[in-house]
Structure formats: C-alpha cells, structure tokens
C-alpha cells in the first residue's frame, strides 16, 4: 500500500510535470507570438485511455516529437532549451510510471495538434492530483 510520504512525493512530481506542461502550452499559446502557428503541422498521438500513472508511457513515447516541435519555437519563449525541458519531463515521467512493469501504450485513432496534446496531458495530471489530495 502506498505510504503518505510516497503519495506526497507522487503528488509533488505530478505538480512539477503539470507546471512544465503548462509552461510549454503558455509559451506556444502566447498571443504575442502567433507566428508559432507553424507548430500546427506537427501531429501527436493521444492515448486511448489515460487514467493511471502507467499510462504516462504514452506521454513518454511522444516526448521526442514534442522536442522536435519545440525546436521551431524561439528559445525566448521558454526558460530552458527544448532538449533540457524535455529531459526534465522525461525524468519525472519515468519516476512516476515506474519501470517494474512494461505497459504497451494504446493510441486513439484521432491525432492531435500540439495544443490538443498538451491540454490532454494537463487534464490527466490535474485528474490524478485531485485523487491524491
């Protein structure tokens, strides 16, 4: 059974992941930078189901494409270089989903733009956090 300390750690990691994803979304949605519409050509794959931490496998598999699309953005939109930002997210995702069991991600048929993709994972983080608090 999860201890209160492990639950607290999980919550903090999810909050960190949530902040990172929100920072990216804010950076690309910035009304002062509509030139980033070029990012809308990139296609992202969404999870069929995302209700448990193991489903973060689906996010992990999309981190490389996420880094590629962020490379189109000017670095001033983010505090960190895309590579460092994605590396940070990857570390959190790996810790959260665990590596004991291998989970095969199932993707939905419909693809998503970067905005839809980020919103989906932001909602996921918020949902899991709410069950922990």
């Amino acid at each position: 059974a999860p201890t209160s300390s492990s639950t607290k750690k999980t919550q903090l990691q999810l909050e960190h992941l949530l902040l990172d994803l929100q920072m990216i979304l804010n950076g690309i949605n910035n009304y002062k930078n509509p030139k980033l519409t070029r990012m809308l050509t990139f296609k992202f794959y969404m999870p069929k189901k995302a209700t448990e931490l193991k489903h973060l496998q689906c996010l992990e598999e999309e981190l490389k494409p996420l880094e590629e699309v962020l490379n189109l953005a000017q670095s001033k939109n983010f505090h960190l270089r895309p590579r460092d930002l994605i590396s940070n997210i990857n570390v959190i995702v790996l810790e959260l989903k665990g590596s004991e069991t291998t989970f095969m991600c199932e993707y939905a048929d419909e693809t998503a733009t970067i905005v839809e993709f980020l919103n989906r994972w932001i909602t996921f983080c918020q949902s899991i956090i709410s069950t922990l608090t």
Epitope: P34, K35, T37, R38, L40, T41, F42, K43, T113
Partner: antibody, heavy 121, light 108 residues
Framework: EVQLVQSGAEVKKPGESLKISCKGS????????IGWVRQMSGKGLEWMGI????????RYSPSFQGQVTISADKSISTAYLQWSSLKASDTAMYYC??????????????WGQGTTVTVSS | SYELTQPPSVSVSPGQTARITCSGD??????AYWYQQKSGQAPVLVIY???KRPSGIPERFSGSSSGTMATLTISGAQVEDEADYYC???????????FGTGTKVTVL
C-alpha cells in the same frame, strides 16, 4: 472582408529585375505568415517560401533559395516577391496566400488573385 | 528534397466516390492539407489537419491519413468537383513545405 490583392501582370526581358506585391486587408497582417506559390503554365503548384511580417522571418524552399527574395512591409500590410535578374523560366503565375492559424490550422485560407509574370526577349 | 506523390488523374462518374492519395515519408508525423484548384482560379482549402473541413466546404469532401499516406475522398462527386487537387505538408523538420504533384479529377 479578409483579402489579399496582388499587383498586376508584368512583361519583362531576361536579366531585368522585378518586384511584385501582395497587399492584405481585413485582418491583422502582422500576425499571419504569408506564402508565395509558383504555377507554371499547365503545371502544378510549387511552394516558394514564407514570411512572417511581424519580424520578417523567412523560410525558402531549397529550389528557390537564392533565386528570389521574399520581404514584407508591415506598415503598409504588403508582402513582396522579387527577382534581381529574371530568366525566361521564371514565366509563371505567382500567388500569395495567408497561412491561417485558428480554424484552418496551418492551411492557406486566403489567396491572392495571382500575378502573371512573362519573361521574354 | 522532400516529395509528396499523387496519382496524375482520377476519373469518376457523377454520384460515385473519388479517392485521391498522397504519399510522403513524413506524413505519419505531419498533417496533410488539401487544395482544390478549378481552371483559371486560385486554389481553395478543402481539408486541413488530415480530416478537418473548413466552413463552407461541402460534407462530401473528407480526409483521412494512415501511415505515410493521406487520402482525400469525394463522396457523391458532382460535375462542379472537376478540378485539380493538391496535397500540401511539411518535411520532417517542419521548416520546408511542399505541394503534392497534383491530381486531375474528371467527373464524367
């Protein structure tokens, strides 16, 4: 009404220079990428390049890099396509188009009427 | 340089279904856009982001994508659909864009 109005048809001699224009109206010209597209007679569409009038960042097709220059003057909501030395092979219809954002994603949702360029000695 | 390949022509009888394909290595990760160009006119966007239809475009136009192939479908083709159709997308870097080779649709 959102529209792009292009300059009129041009007839030039090989080696001459040329600058054609594309004026936007009915929207915030600064905030949308403008693309240029070539169509030779009876042929398909060819992407030449794009410009973001807000800061004049450009991207060129490798096929057109060094052959043409794309520029914009946001103060008069106008984008330009220019040649320093025309060739007979530059004879074509040239379209400007706005990359949408919003409802059309990256799709080019508004097009100019086209400018015919004829280069002949 | 990056290429998008389309069949040169597709013929269809009025009321029948026309399918136009567009093949490109980057399409699993990049959206396809479709343009209709009628003779002597500027192109018109008919499908964006693989399958979304702009307002004002008839429901008979639909799009899909699977792997390296995007498809434009005209269900119940009409005489006024006779035109050239071009797919449009970007290379893997997202920095350079390209039109497909174009497909002439004839409604016999």
């Amino acid at each position: 009404e959102v529209q792009l109005v292009q300059s009129g048809a041009e007839v030039k001699k090989p080696g001459e220079s040329l600058k054609i224009s594309c004026k936007g109206s009915g929207y915030n010209f600064t905030n949308y990428w403008i693309g240029w597209v070539r169509q030779m007679s009876g042929k398909g569409l060819e992407w030449m390049g794009i410009i973001y009038p807000g800061d004049s960042e450009t991207r060129y097709s490798p096929s057109f890099q060094g052959q043409v220059t794309i520029s914009a003057d946001k103060s008069i909501s106008t984008a330009y396509l220019q040649w320093s030395s025309l060739k007979a092979s530059d004879t074509a219809m040239y379209y400007c188009a706005r990359h949408g954002g919003g409802w059309s994603g990256w799709g080019m949702d508004v097009w100019g009427q086209g400018t015919t360029v004829t280069v002949s000695s | 340089s990056y290429e998008l390949t389309q069949p040169p022509s597709v013929s269809v009888s009025p009321g029948q279904t026309a399918r136009i394909t567009c093949s490109g290595d980057a399409l699993p990760r990049k959206y396809a856009y479709w343009y209709q160009q009628k003779s002597g006119q500027a192109p018109v966007l008919v499908i964006y982001e693989d399958s979304k239809r702009p307002s004002g475009i008839p429901e008979r136009f639909s799009g899909s994508s699977s792997g390296t192939m995007a498809t434009l479908t005209i269900s119940g083709a009409q005489v006024e659909d006779e035109a050239d159709y071009y797919c449009y997308s970007t290379d893997s870097s997202g920095n350079h864009y390209v039109f497909g080779t174009g497909t002439k649709v004839t409604v016999l």
